[in-house]
Amino acid sequence: LKGQEFAPSHQQVYAPLRADGDKPRAHLTVVRQTPTQHFKNQFPALHWEHELGLAFTKNRMNYTNKFLLIPESGDYFIYSQVTFRGMTSECSEIRQAGRPNKPDSITVVITKVTDSYPEPTQLLMGTKSVCEVGSNWFQPIYLGAMFSLQEGDKLMVNVSDISLVDYTKEDKTFFGAFLL
Amino acid sequence: LKGQEFAPSHQQVYAPLRADGDKPRAHLTVVRQTPTQHFKNQFPALHWEHELGLAFTKNRMNYTNKFLLIPESGDYFIYSQVTFRGMTSECSEIRQAGRPNKPDSITVVITKVTDSYPEPTQLLMGTKSVCEVGSNWFQPIYLGAMFSLQEGDKLMVNVSDISLVDYTKEDKTFFGAFLL
Amino acid sequence: LKGQEFAPSHQQVYAPLRADGDKPRAHLTVVRQTPTQHFKNQFPALHWEHELGLAFTKNRMNYTNKFLLIPESGDYFIYSQVTFRGMTSECSEIRQAGRPNKPDSITVVITKVTDSYPEPTQLLMGTKSVCEVGSNWFQPIYLGAMFSLQEGDKLMVNVSDISLVDYTKEDKTFFGAFLL
């Protein structure tokens, strides 16, 4: 391959070349959450649409039972947005009553589960106090970063309050990952 | 090419190899929006700087008339941040007056237009209620995710209130996409 | 290499092919900030964990003295999240007292320093007014975009108020970059 002779001189070893089109990738979109049993002491995990509309999984990246299954070791960019909506938190009322005031909050966590490791690893967390004046509020939390994952790792999205997740539109709440 | 022998054994077919440097990419930055005619029943689209300062388009990714034009089918990572700024929303006043209260809101949508398809597709939406106590407020909405796009698809960024977009600095409001 | 014959016909010149696994990459995570001297008229820069826990640097991307050092020219995706937390801003009190009201704010800037250029370049800015009703507030600002960088460029993350940064967990506040 002629072009290879221009490869940077610092590339001392030949690493495997990869066609970009065959890398594991997934973009999952929100579905209405049905009440399920959640693990104790852990935020509930969302489940996702993986093939309809904008959602897809490809190149051995599979979705099963709330988890994205990592088919190949490497560095992945992982992202999620969760849009929350709710009624006024009690925050302002509590404040007006002059009592000390722990604000309500919304939290999203992207979690990695490795079968050989007893505890899940929190990769990303977005957490926000909610102390709204208006009677209805809504807002997104977005997360995204790169992580080194191992074949067999599983990824999920946990939220602090599953009943506040806006499940109405696939563009509002989503979860994805791709091998770099 | 020696390194190829280490390619993962699951790569059953030869996919085309691609030099990363020649992939379609763009990062667009905010410019001041002058009053224009917008489509009825659709949030107004922002127009962008595509060559000055931090902005660029490359490898056949072109910007024209508020649209990024996708030159090649594939999986793209698409992102945008819009910083909004405004004066106090009427929200708190309405609440004080004891009337029911629909909060003001700010919304960003990244939209795909496919000529062969009659309706635009909303890829990403960030929407937030704004019910601020202070007299001046400002805040960003960030979006980013991966989508499978087709050659000829067009991308744009729509906002709920074009007059609240902070156009003063190229690092506050931007829009980009790149082929993975 | 057999697969190459399927390369897009528009690829007129052979660009160097690159194994994805040897591209410069880094994901840095928050550490407690020790009081240091900051440059006048510039927001203070955060320093980071670069090797423990989720943090890593690889393929000649080095972290030193608050900076990520770019080892190779190209297009990079750069991202950061900073989670802030604080007590009530004086904003609502000022408003109630009927005095004019400049809201408190939180700001994150990802900055590029080029030795041959006298002024740092602000690549990304997330800025938000903070005018909370509750007594304790917390919230993240997320940023991410693609930029063309030159070998030797340095990246840092600056914040408006270093004492408000949540340094308690590596998943809440982080900074990363990778060559596309």
Partner: antibody, heavy 118, light 107 residues
């Protein structure tokens, strides 16, 4: 192209009210804030307030509070500014102006001269 | 309210000269500073926004700089059509306020 066309000159007596109109064309009227700015003879520019044509929400400068009313009729893309209890100090050219953002004035009307005289 | 001051209040210059007008805000207004040009009997014309960004269609001989409280408008090589009054305006918070103006006259 974007145009703002204002109503004609007015002569009013002290204590009266004046209502100036501003017809917009060439852009989506409801998408951009409409401002009113006045200029007394030989003086500088003074911002009076804005109306958000979409919601009808207004923001008036303190010195005009209680005397000014800004309204709009979206069906005919027209904004109105009414100033009451006029005094000779209100003699000025009144401009409507629209901005691509709410904090600046891209396009101005031709101005309406209001003279307050007994 | 944020007070805006301009200096000088008037300025005589010749075609081809470089001129600078300064504008100061009574408190920080970040980059939310706009400049306008007004000729006698006409409505103002929008020149510069965000302290330094040229409105489309404005000649490149005009430039702006500054942030916080101190700002400048420069014209690199005066043309006959540039003789007018120039106003700065803060868009940081309401009430929006203008500077008193700088009258640029032919020497």
């Amino acid at each position: 192209q974007v145009q703002l066309v204002q109503s004609g000159a007015e002569v009013k007596e002290p204590g009266a009210s004046v209502k100036v109109s501003c017809k917009a064309s060439g852009y989506t009227f409801t998408a951009y804030y409409m401002h009113w700015v006045r200029q007394a003879p030989g003086q500088g520019l003074e911002w009076m307030g804005w109306i958000n044509p979409n919601s009808g929400g207004t923001n008036y400068a303190q010195q005009f509070q209680g005397r000014v009313t800004m309204t709009r009729d979206t069906s005919i893309s027209t904004a109105y500014m009414e100033l009451s209890r006029l005094t000779s100090d209100d003699t000025a050219v009144y401009y409507c102006a629209v901005g691509g953002s709410y904090d600046a004035f891209d396009i101005w009307g031709q101005g309406t001269m209001v003279t307050v005289s007994s | 309210d944020i007070q805006m001051t301009q200096s000088p209040s008037s300025l005589s210059a010749s075609v081809g000269d470089r001129v600078t007008i300064t504008c100061r805000a009574s408190q920080s207004i970040s980059s939310y500073l706009n400049w306008y040009q007004q000729k006698p009997g006409k409505a103002p014309k929008f020149l510069i926004y965000g302290a330094s960004r040229l409105q489309s269609g404005v000649p490149s001989r005009f430039s702006g700089s500054g942030s916080g409280t101190d700002f400048t408008l420069s014209i690199s090589s005066l043309q006959p059509e540039d003789f007018a009054t120039y106003y700065c305006q803060q868009g940081h918070s309401t009430p929006f306020t203008f500077g008193p103006g700088t009258k640029l006259e032919i020497k």
